[in-house]
């Protein structure tokens, strides 16, 4: 029997220092560009090689960004979210939600599961 797929959701505060080429990532989402059904949140779609985010190592593709410098990203148009990042200054604090896929074993198995993704 196949196990079901569950998700372990954690939150983290990530402080980035803007590098010579910026923060070094792309985003999708917003009220006018829903990336996840019924969720207008902002998601990291690309971490650029050798950019500030990649060098820091904590931000991951697929993470949901909840706030920038304490400002909530809920219910923002996509371009407004983009502008918020671009105007966020030199030191940028991100509150992010990581979603780790966990493959559970068959029913009755009480192991921790096999993280993947």
């Amino acid at each position: 029997m196949n196990g079901r797929v569950d998700y372990l959701v954690t939150e983290e505060e990530i402080n980035l220092t803007r590098g010579p080429s910026g923060l070094g990532f792309n985003i999708v989402g917003g009220t006018d560009q829903q990336y996840v059904s019924n969720d207008s949140g902002i998601y990291v779609s690309r971490i650029k090689e050798n950019g500030a985010a990649a060098l820091d190592g904590r931000l991951q593709e697929g993470d949901k960004i909840l706030s920038v410098n304490g400002q909530d990203l809920k219910n923002l148009l996509h371009q407004d979210a983009v502008d918020l990042f671009r105007n966020a200054g030199y030191a940028v604090s991100l509150r992010v939600q990581h979603r780790l896929q966990v493959q559970n074993g068959p029913i009755g198995h009480r192991g921790e599961g096999d993280p993947s993704g």
């Epitope: 080429s21 910026g22 923060l23 070094g24 990532f25 792309n26 985003i27 999708v28 990336y35 998601y43 990291v44 779609s45 690309r46 971490i47 090689e49 593709e61 697929g62 996509h78 371009q79 983009v82 990042f85 671009r86 993704g117």
Partner: nanobody, 128 residues
Framework: DVQLVESGGGLVQAGGSLRLSCAAS????????MGWFRQRPGKERDVVAT????????YYLDSVKGRFTISRDNAKNTVFLQMNSLKPEDTAVYYC??????????????????????WGQGTQVTVS
């Protein structure tokens, strides 16, 4: 990480057609910009065609315009390259490539160019 597997290559006569497919796995396909590149014998790897994550923007190498068509099927996690009116100079190893799409948080002018983060192993196309 993203895994890419190309298929559909082969030997075809000049004037013929082939349809290349690239199946992606490892993360949501709908957020990926996709591209097809080729490496001809003794040459650098060149971009052939690209399609952005929303499917509303495409690019074609001048020499394939009107002959090749890139498309994507998000339901099947697959990108296609329909190649018609093939010429001997189209002979090459064709590679599928992917990167995260969306908007750069750094600059409106940073559209990524032809820099891709994930690559397939390639499929040989030979036009005789």
């Amino acid at each position: 990480d993203v895994q890419l597997v190309e298929s559909g290559g082969g030997l075809v006569q000049a004037g013929g057609s082939l349809r290349l497919s690239c199946a992606a796995s490892g993360r949501p396909f709908s957020s990926l910009d996709m591209g097809w590149f080729r490496q001809r014998p003794g040459k650098e790897r060149d971009v052939v065609a690209t399609i952005n994550w929303t499917g509303d923007s495409t690019y074609y190498l001048d020499s394939v315009k009107g002959r090749f068509t890139i498309s994507r099927d998000n339901a099947k996690n697959t990108v296609f390259l329909q190649m018609n009116s093939l010429k001997p100079e189209d002979t090459a190893v064709y590679y599928c490539a992917a990167r995260g799409g969306g908007s750069s948080v750094d600059s409106e002018y940073d559209v990524g160019g032809f820099e891709y983060d994930y690559w397939g192993q390639g499929t040989q196309v030979t036009v005789s």
